[in-house]
Each structure stands twice: as C-alpha cells, then as structure tokens.
Interface confidence: medium
C-alpha cells in the first residue's frame, strides 16, 4: 500500500533503535571513509526529520523518497570531492541514477586499517559509559569495511556483541570471557559477509531470476514438505528482501525481512515442522534463526524424479507450455530430494536438464534423446564429491594452517600474477573450509564445502575485477556463478607466467616478527611462501616444504635468542642462500 510519507512509515514499522542502526549502516556503506562522528550526526538529523514526519506526514519534504532524502544528506557533506574523488560526481545526477552511481562506487576492499579490538578493560569501560555509542561504532566499523553486509543481520550481530559485553564485563576475568565469544561472533559475521556479497553479485550480474533459482533450490532443501507454490512464494519474497538490501534500500529490506519471518511463523503448518523454536524468539534472533534452520524431515513417499521429468510422455509439452514453471518444478523436486547436495550443484543439474530439453524437444524422438539425462548427471555429481573427499583428507592430514599453505601453493600456481596479499587472504579463507565443513557429518559436507568455496571465490573475482592481471582468473570469473568453483578447481599451472626474479629483501625478516600475534606471524610466513612459488612456480611440494621448515626453524631460533637483532641480521642472509640453493 502507498504511504504519504515513506520515511514515517519505515520509522513506525522499525522503531527508533533499528531505524537509527539501519540508517547508520546505510551511510557507512555508501561513504566508507567518513568518521563515526560525521555519520552519527547525519543519522541524528535523519531521525529527527523522520520524527517530524511521523507527527505530520504532510510536513515539508516528508513525501520525498528515501533515496532522495538520504542522497541529499550524503551530497551535503563538506569536502566530498577531496575525500571521495569522482564519487562526488554522483551528486550531479537525479534519482534513481544518483543512487545507482553511489552503489557503483562501493569499494569491496577499502584501504582502511584492520578493525582492531581494544583491550578488554578499555572495551568494558567505554561500553558501560555509553552502550549506544559503543554499538554505533561497531555498526560503523563493520559496515564501512563490508559495504554489502546484510543490514538486518548486522543488527543481529551487534545485538550478540551487546549481550556478550553485558555478560563478560561483569566477570572478574573479562579477557578470557570476551575473547572466545567475540572471536566466534567475528568468524560468523565474516562468513555472513562473503555469503551476502555472493547473493548481491548474483543479483547484480545475472538478475533476479538467477537469485530466485538459488532461493528455490535452497528453500526446497530446507522445507521439503512445502509445496511448489509455497516455495515459490517464499523465494519471491526472499528475492525482494535481498534485492532491496543489495540495492541499498536497507529500511525496506529490514522491514520486508521482518514481514517474511512473521509470515513463515504464521504458516508453519504448510512450511516446516522445525520452525517453532525460531518463532519463539524476538525479531532479530527469529529472522537469523529462520535463515539457518535445520532441514525438515523429507516426506517418506516421494516418487522417483524420473516419473515426471523423464518417463512422462508429456515432458516436452509441459516444458513448452511454461518453461520457467516446469524448470522451477524440476529444481524444486530435485532439491527437496537432495539436502546433501550444494545449491551450486543443484543449479548446474537444472541447467543441464534445461539444455537437454532444449536440444531433445526439437528432435524427432525426444524421449529417446532425453531418456538418459539423469545418468548424464553422474559426472556433475561425482566432481564435487571427489573435491570434498580429497580436500577433507588433506585437511585432516595437515591441519588448518598446513591446509591453507597447500591451497596457497595451488592457487599461486594457477594465478601467479594476482597480488600476494590477495592470494594469501584467499588461501586463508579457502583453507578455513576444512575447520568449518570437514568435521560435519558426511551428508552435510558437500553443501557446506562447495557453497562456502563459491562465496570465497566470488570475493577473489571482485578483487580481481578492480585490477585484472590473470587471464586464468578472468576466464573463471566471467562465466556463470555456479560454474566458477569447478572452473577454478580445473585450473592448472599457468604456463604463460614468467617467474619473478629472486629478491633477497622479500625474504629478509627482522626481530619485530617475534612479538606479532600468531595470526600475523602466519600471514608473514604465507606471504613468503607465495613469493617463493612466484619465483619458482614449478617447485615441488618437497622443495617448498624444505624451505618452509628451514624458515620456521630460523624464526624459532632467532626469536628465542638473547640478541634477536644480531641473530636475524646474521642468520637471515644464510637462510636466503639456503632457500636459493634448495630451489635451484
């Protein structure tokens, strides 16, 4: 229904706290360099204005669209051109072009320092002094580093953060209470960020239809007892919610997500028997819980998929009559029978089925032609299954750090032109798949591994798009989203690459490495490993292991030495010489 004042409508629906949080996220995602104080000031102005519109919807400017109101606020920021360069040109445009322009200037890899967590005592002090400002800082810092973070979900993580601080700041040993809990939230939030970025990429590159297909597959796996019309209804609504969030319409997105959660909880009977626990929770927790609810039990009496989609004499007629609905039904039926497959795999199978019907329904004897289609799915299913087995075996043998190193070597060989920081970040993220997925029960491994890898590779593609350097990466990133992971897996050593010359300074380390946290030490070592592979792309695993073991021994020795600086300056050059010899 149309409202006289959109901003008043959203303020009323969302309530002041969520309204302010979402406006802060929106501004932080658009203008990623502004300080918290600058954004907080704008948020307060927008909130005060919204309140006047709630009091009188006919007041001046209350009838303006949210894009117009927010865009005007952003464009009024002083020194916009000095701080943001050509983004300031967006302000010369009218809506909706202005908003599109802002979206195009979102930076997936902003040059901001890593978000450092303060000491426990300091954190608790500032949290107790002003919890609202403290949480505002959290929203601002995460949103500006992750400009496509799913806004209502970020409010959920802020709420988690708040609860952890409330609990731990009352404890004697704040540090040991806070660290593991906040690490857990951070890990989940980072995964949520790459997953959502993948959804926005799907929407931006391939449109709503592609996202809706993803949603149909995912929802059918989770709710196998819901009928096709129910799944399509949920997929349609979910597509709208994601389109809004990806498009920067965060108030609408959060409002519609709350509506969808309400609908699901009111219609549990036709959706799933597993929703009640989620539905008992307050809004943010409820929506989060529904998004990762366990799969419902599959109906016991499902007929074989072949009956309707291969053996039925009317397959081509049904397909011709309504292609999208018929293919949607196929995707629904196949997905509800296979919670053990990844969504990417299910979409590849649906694509294969569509291609088969396109070809066969034009032939003289269609049933003879499409009769083997299910058998032709076999290699498509085996490939990711083998990937999971091989990688989980390797992870179990090497542990997370060793597994990350194996992936780093593999990917540096595939795309040695890619910058070392990007390769290290990608390998570390790809390597976490072991810890995340390989410990799960057998039937949950494939969906976990492949859908997580796809999301990480999407980030690789986004970073590479900014400065394309590798033809291998360009090739894999320009295909469809669901083909990316198999494409990257199939890449081999890039034979066109001219090895980097050996630079001693790349492998020269100083005593400051000794005081770094373990994670930073690992990154330093992995940076050196990537550089080694760039120098010798065809080095054997054995050669690389020899060098890395030597390197680890060198660090261990010098960091334990009484005179660390002398140790590094005398032993370092020896290490470099041994490395060169080992790789000769």
């Amino acid at each position: 229904e149309a409202h006289k004042s959109e901003i008043a409508h959203r303020y009323n629906d969302l309530g002041e706290q969520h309204f302010k949080g979402l406006v802060l996220i929106a501004f932080s995602q658009y203008l990623q360099k502004c300080s918290y104080d600058e954004h907080a000031k704008l948020v307060q102005e927008v909130t005060d204005f919204a309140k006047t519109c709630v009091a009188d919807e006919s007041a001046a400017n209350c009838d303006k669209s949210l894009h117009t109101l927010f865009g005007d606020k952003l464009c009024a920021i002083p020194n916009l051109r000095e701080n943001y360069g050509e983004l300031a040109d967006c302000c010369t445009k009218q809506e909706p072009e202005r908003n599109e322009c802002f979206l195009q200037h979102k930076d997936d890899n902003p040059s901001l320092p890593p978000f450092e967590r303060p000491e426990a005592e300091a954190m608790c002090t500032s949290f107790k002094e002003n919890p609202t400002t403290f949480m505002g800082h959290y929203l601002h810092e995460v949103a500006r580093r992750h400009p496509y973070f799913y806004a209502p979900e970020l409010l959920y993580y802020a709420e988690q953060y708040n609860e952890i601080l409330t609990q731990c700041c009352a404890e004697a040993d704040k540090e040991s209470c806070l660290t593991p809990k906040l690490d857990g939230v951070k890990e989940k939030a980072l995964v949520s960020s790459v997953r959502q970025r993948m959804k926005c990429s799907s929407m931006q590159k391939f449109g709503e239809r592609a996202f809706k297909a993803w949603a149909v597959a995912r929802l059918s796996q989770t709710f196998p007892n819901a009928d096709f019309a129910e799944i399509t209804k949920l997929a349609t609504d979910l597509t709208k919610v994601n389109k809004e969030c990806c498009h920067g319409d965060l108030l609408e997105c959060a409002d519609d997500r709350a509506e969808l959660a309400k609908y699901m909880c009111e219609n549990q009977a036709t959706i799933s028997s597993k929703l009640q626990t989620c539905c008992d929770k307050p809004l943010l927790k409820k929506a989060h819980c529904l998004s990762e609810v366990e799969h419902d039990t599959m109906p016991a009496d499902l007929p074989a998929i072949a009956a309707d989609f291969v053996e039925d004499q009317e397959v081509c007629k049904n397909y011709a009559e309504a292609k999208d609905v018929f293919l949607g039904t196929f995707l629904y039926e196949y997905s509800r029978r296979h919670p053990d497959y990844s969504v990417s795999l299910l979409l590849r199978l649906a694509k294969k089925y569509e291609a088969t019907l396109e070809k066969c329904c034009a032939e003289a004897n269609p049933p003879a032609c499409y009769g083997t289609v299910l058998a032709e799915f076999q290699p498509l299913v085996e490939e990711p299954k083998n990937l999971v087995k091989t990688n989980c075996d390797l992870y179990e043998k090497l542990g997370e750090y060793g597994f990350q190193n194996a992936i780093l070597v593999r990917y540096t060989q595939k795309a040695p032109q890619v910058s070392t920081p990007t390769l290290v970040e990608a390998a570390r993220n790809l390597g976490r798949v072991g810890t995340k997925c390989c410990t799960l029960p057998e039937d949950q491994r494939l969906p976990c591994v492949e859908d997580y890898l796809s999301a990480i590779l999407n980030r690789v593609c986004l970073l590479h798009e900014k400065t394309p350097v590798s033809e291998h990466v360009t090739k894999c990133c320009s295909g469809s989203l669901v083909e990316r992971r198999p494409c990257f897996s199939a890449l081999t050593v890039d034979e066109t690459y001219v090895p980097k010359e050996f630079k001693a300074e790349t492998f020269t380390f100083h005593s400051d490495i000794c005081t770094l946290p373990e994670k930073e030490k690992q990154i330093k070592k992995q940076t050196a490993l990537a550089e080694l592979v760039k120098h010798k792309p065809k080095a054997t695993a054995e050669q690389l292991k020899t060098v890395m073991d030597d390197f680890a021994q060198f660090l261990d020795t010098c960091c334990k030495a009484a005179d660390k600086d002398t140790c590094f300056s005398t032993e370092g050059p020896n290490l470099v010489t041994r490395c060169k010899d080992a790789l000769a």
Partner: nanobody, 119 residues
C-alpha cells in the same frame, strides 16, 4: 471429505469473457495452493494457472498469460478464474484442483465445467 465444485462455464463468442468459480470444502482452503487445469476435446490435461494460499504469487501458462486472471476469496473458500479475450483454442473442460506436491499429479479435483468458445 474433500469436495471441489466448479461453475460458470458456457458458450461464449471469440473475444468474449467468462468467470469461473470453484467452491471448496472438506479441507483447510486458506493453507492450500490451488490451480485451474483444462482438457480440450481429445487432448491431454493442460495446467492453466496456480495461486498461492495467500493470493500471491500467481502463475499462468504462456498460452493464457495476459488474458486470464486467477484469484481467491479465502473467507468464502472460493477460487475464481476470470477469462477475457477468449479464443476458440480455449474450448475445454476446466477443472479446479488442490495444488499437489509433484508436477502433473493432482490430489483432488472437481467434476469440471465446460467452456465453449465459438461464433
């Protein structure tokens, strides 16, 4: 016991309109997706349109898109099909059905109502 009773069929000229109704009983109508299917003389079943329990979304076969509108009134347990710009090829027995869980297999359907489009 599930019952579906269609009405509203008849003879109409090409370009004319008809509104079909389907009264439902014996099940919880407002939690069931519903659809219209038709069978032309000597032909197989063809689905026409689907409507979700809440009234949206709705789906149409390509052959009727833009001419037919499916709707429902959950308070009256009734399903409707508004047919405009009718053509000779729309001649068929129209059935309303409770939406099934697999493509092309209908759990319950009525006895049908005949629509004849002819000049």
């Amino acid at each position: 016991e599930v019952q579906l009773l269609e009405s509203g069929g008849g003879l109409v000229q090409p370009g004319g309109s008809l509104r079909l109704s389907c009264a439902a009983s014996g099940f919880t109508f407002d939690t069931s997706s519903m659809l219209w299917v038709r069978q032309a003389p000597g032909k197989g079943l063809e689905w026409v349109s689907v409507i979700h329990q809440s009234g949206t979304p709705t789906y149409y076969a390509d052959s009727v898109k833009g001419r037919f509108t499916i709707s429902r009134d959950n308070s009256k347990n009734t399903l409707y099909l508004q047919m405009n710009s009718l053509r000779a090829e729309d001649t068929a027995v129209y059935y309303c059905a409770k939406f099934p869980s697999t493509h092309g297999k209908f759990d319950y359907w009525g006895q049908g109502t005949l629509v004849t489009v002819s000049s």
